[in-house]
């Protein structure tokens, strides 16, 4: 079975950082030349003489960890025999992904006219690891001009409630900007747009007469 070499580095290491090394011995005592095979992301280079492996591009845990490549050790001179080992680079997470909406929320709506202030629930996520506990996002409006019409309140670490502050909304689309902060180190913030449609309803769903063209929705902020 192939020998497996492992190394562990933070995904934000500087380009040119030594991330590991592989060593091989030739029974006849000949020099060995090292090369990489399967570096599909172009992240690594190997010193042909020493077997030291360096990063040559930004690493990204979210693209996949561990990152697996093969190291080929070849005799210099002689019969040029070679052997292949596995090198597994385990990438440790850095908080480098801003929060985002957990799914496509293009279908959010309220039945028009509102008889009382209403609310809806949305969910946030990100692509970073959350060891020992789940994500703890905080939610706030993206502009003070929204405060007269909307209120956002946290339900838990991943979910929040968007509520209307009055019932005077027209039958049209409004886009509500929401800031989501992950509270990480460093804290990252994402600004997301929640499109909310106020529409005439039939049996609890938006009613769109056949052939009705809504035109370009106006952004409400």
């Amino acid at each position: 079975s192939q020998h497996v070499f492992q190394a562990k580095v933070s995904e934000d290491v500087a380009i040119g950082t030594k991330v590991g090394n592989v060593t091989a011995k030739d029974p006849e005592g000949l020099d060995i030349s090292y090369s990489l095979r399967g570096d599909t992301r172009g992240w690594l280079k190997i010193d042909h003489v020493t077997g030291e492996i360096f990063s040559v591009a930004p690493l990204d845990r979210e693209a996949g960890s561990p990152y697996r490549v093969q190291v080929v050790a070849t005799e210099v001179g002689g019969s040029s025999l070679s052997s292949v080992s596995e090198f597994h680079l385990i990438l440790m997470d850095v908080n480098d992904n801003p929060p985002r909406l957990a799914k496509d929320y293009t279908g959010l709506f309220f039945c028009h006219p509102l008889s009382a202030p209403g609310s809806l629930i949305f969910e946030a996520t990100d692509d970073d690891q959350h060891l020992f506990r789940g994500p703890h996002f905080t939610f706030s409006l993206g502009s003070g001009s929204l405060q007269n019409d909307w209120e956002v309140s946290k339900i838990n670490g991943t979910h929040a409630r968007l509520s209307t502050r009055h019932t005077e909304f027209e039958e049209r689309e409004y886009v509500v900007l929401i800031r989501i902060n992950d509270g990480g180190r460093p804290p990252l913030e994402g600004i997301v747009s929640l499109p909310v449609t106020f529409c005439s309803c039939v049996e609890g769903s938006c009613f769109r007469p056949a052939g009705h063209q809504t035109g370009i929705p106006t952004v409400g902020m």
Epitope: S140, S143, G144, S145, R172, R179, T218, V219, G220, M221
Partner: antibody, heavy 115, light 108 residues
Framework: QVQLVQSGAEVKKPGASVKVSCKAS????????MHWVKQAPGQRLEWIGE????????NYNQKFKGKATLTVDKSASTAYMELSSLRSEDTAVYYC????????WGQGTTVTVSS | EIVLTQSPGTLSLSPGERATLSCSVS???????LHWYQQKPGQAPRLLIY???NRASGIPDRFSGSGSGTDFTLTISRLEPEDFAVYYC?????????FGQGTRLEIK
């Protein structure tokens, strides 16, 4: 009741900076964003930007990016607007305002830029 | 940015008359995002009407607002001497928030 009390008039030389303050009372300071508005002599009102006092996140009118910097001191319930590299066109009355409820404005601070 | 154009620039009327002030918006906005302010010399703007048609606290019922889309109107049914001032419309639909250039209401 809500009160926004601004600092006094300032006279500055071109190239200087000025920092206008807006002391808020009568409500929880971190609850509502603070807005700043410019009114040059005989001109329409111009929105400069807004700041969320809870975390100092700010949105600026593109026209005032690099000119105005909005900050807050939560412990003093005070918002600040600093104007840099002053020119004669910056001569104006500057207002802080709570857009929440639309109706609460400071009394205005006159900034005069003159050599 | 959304541009608000007010007309007329100056309106000369007598006390007791009816005043109609217009605000044209460069892009359609929701009624909930159009507001009117009154400003007198040396004073901060004072909120008159919010969300197109709601009178602010303490504003007499001679002031009313209407409109939708791109055309909005402030009406003062019977002018009182204290109503002569500059009136601004303002939109809160898009950043940056913008104001009209103002209509000066003066005594004829």
């Amino acid at each position: 009741q809500v009160q926004l009390v601004q600092s006094g008039a300032e006279v500055k030389k071109p190239g200087a900076s000025v920092k206008v303050s807006c002391k808020a009372s009568g409500y929880t300071f971190t609850t509502y964003w603070m807005h700043w508005v410019k009114q040059a002599p005989g001109q329409r009102l111009e929105w400069i930007g807004e700041i969320d006092p809870s975390d100092s996140y700010a949105n600026y009118n593109q026209k005032f990016k690099g000119k105005a910097t909005l900050t807050v001191d939560k412990s003093a319930s005070t918002a600040y607007m600093e104007l840099s590299s002053l020119r004669s066109e910056d001569t104006a009355v500057y207002y802080c305002a709570l857009y929440y409820g639309y109706g609460d404005w400071g009394q205005g601070t006159t900034v005069t830029v003159s050599s | 940015e959304i541009v608000l154009t007010q007309s007329p620039g100056t309106l000369s009327l007598s006390p007791g008359e009816r005043a109609t002030l217009s605000c044209s918006v460069s892009a359609s906005i929701s009624r909930i995002h159009l507001h009117w302010y009154q400003q007198k010399p040396g004073q901060a703007p004072r909120l008159l009407i919010y969300r197109t048609r709601n009178r602010a606290s303490g504003i007499p019922d001679r002031f009313s607002g209407s409109g939708s889309g791109t055309d909005f109107t402030l009406t003062i049914s019977r002018l009182e001497p204290e109503d002569f001032a500059v009136y601004y419309c303002q939109q809160g639909s898009n950043l940056p928030l913008t104001f009209g250039q103002g209509t000066r209401l003066e005594i004829k």
